[in-house]
């Protein structure tokens, strides 16, 4: 039995910071879990990961290239990424694994979320000299 996950298909970011919510068809408070966020079509890079259960709030840790934190309630894990750059634009996949108690459960691969980080253009206004 695979768990289903819902993600927003697209997030356009112009503030260098984004919150991505992963909504699961399973009660997160029922078991001990490992929630992670992966970057890339083949989920090559583990961006952020947190372990949690019903008795403690998870500690999220990030890949060296990213800054992340997270939070969860009974059906949603929310990853917050900041200091994002244009080259972080990519598709991101939510993953969850329920380890304890058995049986092991994980989610069906979702369609992912394209996070598009907009380039910041600095506007230099031509100032007229005072007469």
């Amino acid at each position: 039995n695979k768990i289903l996950v819902k993600q927003s298909p697209l997030l356009v970011v112009d503030s260098n910071e984004v919150s991505l919510s992963c909504r699961y068809s399973y009660n997160l408070l029922a078991k001990e879990f490992r929630a992670s966020l992966y970057k890339g079509v083949n989920s090559d890079v583990e961006v952020c990961v947190g372990n949690g259960n019903f008795t403690y709030q998870p500690q999220f840790r990030s890949n060296a290239e990213f800054n992340c934190d997270g939070d969860f309630d009974n059906e949603t894990v929310t990853f917050r990424l900041w200091n994002l750059h244009v080259n972080h634009t990519d598709i991101y996949f939510c993953k969850i694994e329920f380890m304890y108690p058995p049986p092991y459960l994980d989610n069906e691969r979702s369609n992912g979320t394209i996070i598009h980080i907009k380039e910041k253009h600095l506007c230099h206004t031509q100032s007229s000299p005072k007469l």
Partner: antibody, heavy 120, light 111 residues
Framework: EVQLVESGGGLVQPGGSLRLSCAAS??????????VSWIRQAPGKGLEWIGE???????YYSPSLKSRVTISRDNSKNTLYLQLNSLRAEDTAVYYC????????????WGQGTLVTVSS | DIQLTQSPSSLSASVGDRVTITCRAS??????????LHWYQQKPGKAPKLLIY???SLQSGVPSRFSGSGSGTDFTLTISSLQPEDFATYYC?????????FGQGTKVEIK
């Protein structure tokens, strides 16, 4: 037929590191449904769980060893590894790898074990 | 961590005897009606061998003289009629929570 074969044991200096291998056959380490744990047994003592790796590559470790241990695998060789650092005399033990299925997490297949002796 | 306490630590018995070993967990190891408590047999110089899984299910190939019972925190391994090959050390193990833990073992010796 499922088989697990450990190797890499021997005499190690205190403060040194060990890297043990567990070659699996009869099942794939990267296919869903099974994971593998490392378990050790000091001479004349009971069994101590070290940690585990799931088919996904996710790992869990014993809190008492977490800072010194890494479990990894090479899917192309269907082999599991245990790296243990900063070795001390009390790490002297027979090290086993054992497979578990995802329904109950009982250890249904075990390797023969490999002895690691930490001594100067 | 969940502590598992086995009793007795050792026992002497004769061939044909009925032997009972108990395992007590520091908290319940039940989830959705399943007890995540398993029993292993270990002979000197050998790896442990799974006997009973999920408290009462007999592992394939294990003789029917071995049985397990219990739920929650109290579990029992019974050997109905001890055979010469049964002299060994027996361990219980829980997989309800990480870290997985084992009992300290019960050594069954010849009287």
């Amino acid at each position: 037929e499922v088989q697990l074969v450990e190797s890499g044991g021997g005499l190690v200096q205190p403060g040194g590191s060990l890297r043990l291998s567990c070659a699996a056959s009869g099942f794939s380490l990267s296919t869903g449904g099974v994971g593998v744990s490392w378990i050790r047994q000091a001479p004349g003592k009971g069994l101590e769980w070290i940690g585990e790796i799931y088919h996904s590559g996710s790992t869990y470790y014993s809190p008492s060893l977490k800072s010194r241990v890494t479990i990894s695998r090479d899917n192309s060789k269907n082999t599991l590894y245990l790296q243990l650092n900063s070795l001390r005399a009390e790490d002297t033990a027979v090290y086993y790898c054992a497979r578990y299925e995802y329904d109950y997490y009982d250890f249904d297949y075990w390797g023969q074990g490999t002895l690691v002796t930490v001594s100067s | 961590d969940i502590q598992l306490t086995q009793s007795p630590s050792s026992l002497s018995a004769s061939v044909g005897d009925r032997v009972t070993i108990t395992c007590r967990a520091s908290q319940s190891v039940d989830f959705h009606g399943i007890s995540f408590l398993h029993w292993y047999q270990q002979k000197p110089g050998k790896a442990p061998k799974l006997l009973i899984y999920a408290a009462s299910s007999l592992q394939s190939g294990v003789p029917s003289r071995f049985s397990g019972s219990g739920s929650g925190t109290d579990f029992t391994l019974t050997i109905s009629s001890l055979q010469p090959e049964d002299f060994a050390t027996y361990y219980c193990q829980q997989s309800y929570r990480s870290p997985r833990t084992f009992g300290q073992g019960t050594k069954v010796e010849i009287k």
